[in-house]
Interface confidence: medium
């Protein structure tokens, strides 16, 4: 006899990285017929939803209208059908960004290099705790983690034209609180003359779907909706 139901799926829309004071929705998808969903935050009951009618709904949404550091952390959800409860979902790490300060990103030997050269990015932030994240714009949304007291090094090693693209970094105040993004640094890698035109470049999404930051006079550094790889989620594990 089955003791528990299969675990639900949990995710955040538009993204698990949420600029402070912006909205986010935590979604929990279980089974049709579930009469109750519970959202847990850092191990404690956070919210309850009872879908109506349960037989027509298999997903609930928990809306956070105003993200802040107190709401950042690990979420999970469970549901029940009748008296039978599900296994808990995987953990969702909800991260608040645009906290406090802005790091500086630089690249050595420079932003224009030749294929094969060794390139290192440096992310500096006086006030971060010790962890830094380097992100490359694009479909695969590469994320690297680095450590240092006020600066982290990100050695890319000998680069190829596949390393071309736009990079940004964040400083982390803790696992769930990240700084503003640095200003972008565009890395230009020149390959062999005959290969340059055919060099593969990490394909990027349009600006409105990649997690880039737009500079506007109205809001300063503003986070766009993003659908990043779950690589960044895994970094928090």
């Amino acid at each position: 006899q089955q003791q528990t139901l299969p675990k639900p799926f949990i995710w955040a829309e538009p993204h698990f990285m949420v600029p402070k004071e912006k909205q986010v929705t935590i979604c929990c998808q279980g089974n049709y017929g579930a009469v109750e969903y519970q959202l847990h935050f850092e191990g404690s009951l956070f919210a309850v939803d009872r879908p109506k009618p349960p037989e027509r709904i298999n997903k609930v949404q928990f809306y956070i209208p105003d993200m802040n550091s107190r709401m950042a952390g690990q979420y999970s959800c469970i549901y029940r059908v009748g008296e039978l409860w599900s296994e808990p979902s995987n953990l969702l790490d909800l991260v608040v960004t645009e906290m406090y300060d802005t790091p500086t990103l630089s690249v050595h030997p420079g932003p224009e290099v030749i294929s094969g050269e060794k390139v290192t990015f440096y992310c500096r932030l006086d006030t971060a705790t010790s962890m830094f994240l380097l992100l490359k714009e694009g479909r695969s949304s590469h994320v690297q983690r680095g450590y240092g007291k006020v600066q982290a090094e990100f050695p890319l090693g000998p680069v190829t034209t596949a390393h071309r693209g736009t990079y940004r970094c964040f400083g982390s105040y803790n696992n769930h609180a990240w700084s503003f993004p640095s200003e972008p640094v565009k890395l230009l890698v020149t390959g062999d003359i005959e290969n340059t035109s055919l060099a593969p470049e990490d394909p990027t999404f349009p600006a409105d779907t990649w997690g880039t930051y737009l500079l506007t006079t109205e809001t300063g550094l503003q986070k766009d909706h993003a659908l990043w790889d779950h690589t960044a989620q895994n970094l928090l594990r």
Epitope: K20, E21, D66, N68, S69, R70, V96, E98, M99, Y100, D101, T102, D126, T127, Y173, A177, S179, F180, T217, G220, L221
Partner: antibody, heavy 120, light 107 residues
Framework: EVQLQQSGPELVKPGASVKMSCKAS????????INWGKQRSGQGLEWIGE????????YYNEKFKAKATLTADKSSNIAYMQLSSLTSEDSAVYFC?????????????WGQGTSVTVSS | DIQMTQTTSSLSASLGDRVTISCRAS??????LNWYQQKPDGTVKLLIY???RLHSGVPSRFSGSGSGTDYSLTINNLEQEDIATYFC?????????FGGGTKLEIK
């Protein structure tokens, strides 16, 4: 609406200490840095230091390290600045200001100032 | 420490005028330059951040420009409510430092 409400004027004797407050409202207190500044009569502003209320981390202007102590009470959304061993040079208006939401080291909301007069 | 210099300590202008206030840093501050307005009652407000970005709620007659070490604040079509002292502040390196201020008066 973001507001920073500072405590009232202080008249203190030389050698004494004073502790002033800055009550924040209209935003999540722990998510923004609070700065403190000094303005002597008819003069410019001097930056004293800043506190990260979420962690209690402080950064001070070297000039004020021995003079000012910054603290914050997360439960009441109040930042404090204590000034010690007061002299006539410390007579000034002291401002608290929130470092802005832009991440670009600008102070977007300011308190109304607390006037401190050091006199025997 | 980075020194911020506002060479003009006071300035007289007529209503409707275009007024420019300048600020010089002792070293390159990479556009981390902010402008504040202090009214006669002591109230301080942020006008411009990061050289040229207008803070929310600030009238569009205020604008900022500059780079490197030299920056300026421009007020177009001066109004009575603009009578105040204007301070620049660098946000490039701690300790954050302010200019001495430029007091704007009506002719």
């Amino acid at each position: 609406e973001v507001q920073l409400q500072q405590s009232g004027p202080e008249l203190v004797k030389p050698g004494a200490s004073v502790k002033m407050s800055c009550k924040a409202s209209g935003y999540t207190f722990t998510d923004y840095v609070i700065n403190w500044g000094k303005q002597r009569s008819g003069q410019g502003l001097e930056w004293i230091g800043e506190i990260y209320p979420g962690s209690g981390t402080n950064y001070y202007n070297e000039k004020f390290k021995a003079k000012a102590t910054l603290t914050a009470d997360k439960s009441s959304n109040i930042a404090y600045m204590q000034l010690s061993s007061l002299t006539s040079e410390d007579s000034a208006v002291y401002f608290c200001a929130r470092r802005g939401r832009y991440g670009l080291y600008a102070m977007d909301y300011w308190g109304q100032g607390t006037s401190v007069t050091v006199s025997s | 420490d980075i020194q911020m210099t506002q060479t003009t300590s006071s300035l007289s202008a007529s209503l409707g005028d275009r007024v420019t206030i300048s600020c010089r840093a002792s070293q390159d501050i990479s556009n981390y330059l902010n402008w504040y307005q202090q009214k006669p009652d002591g109230t301080v407000k942020l006008l411009i951040y990061y050289t040229s970005r207008l803070h929310s709620g600030v009238p569009s007659r205020f604008s900022g420009s500059g780079s490197g070490t030299d920056y300026s604040l421009t007020i177009n079509n001066l109004e009575q409510e603009d009578i105040a002292t204007y301070f620049c502040q660098q946000g490039n390196t701690r300790p954050w430092t302010f200019g001495g201020g430029t007091k704007l008066e009506i002719k």
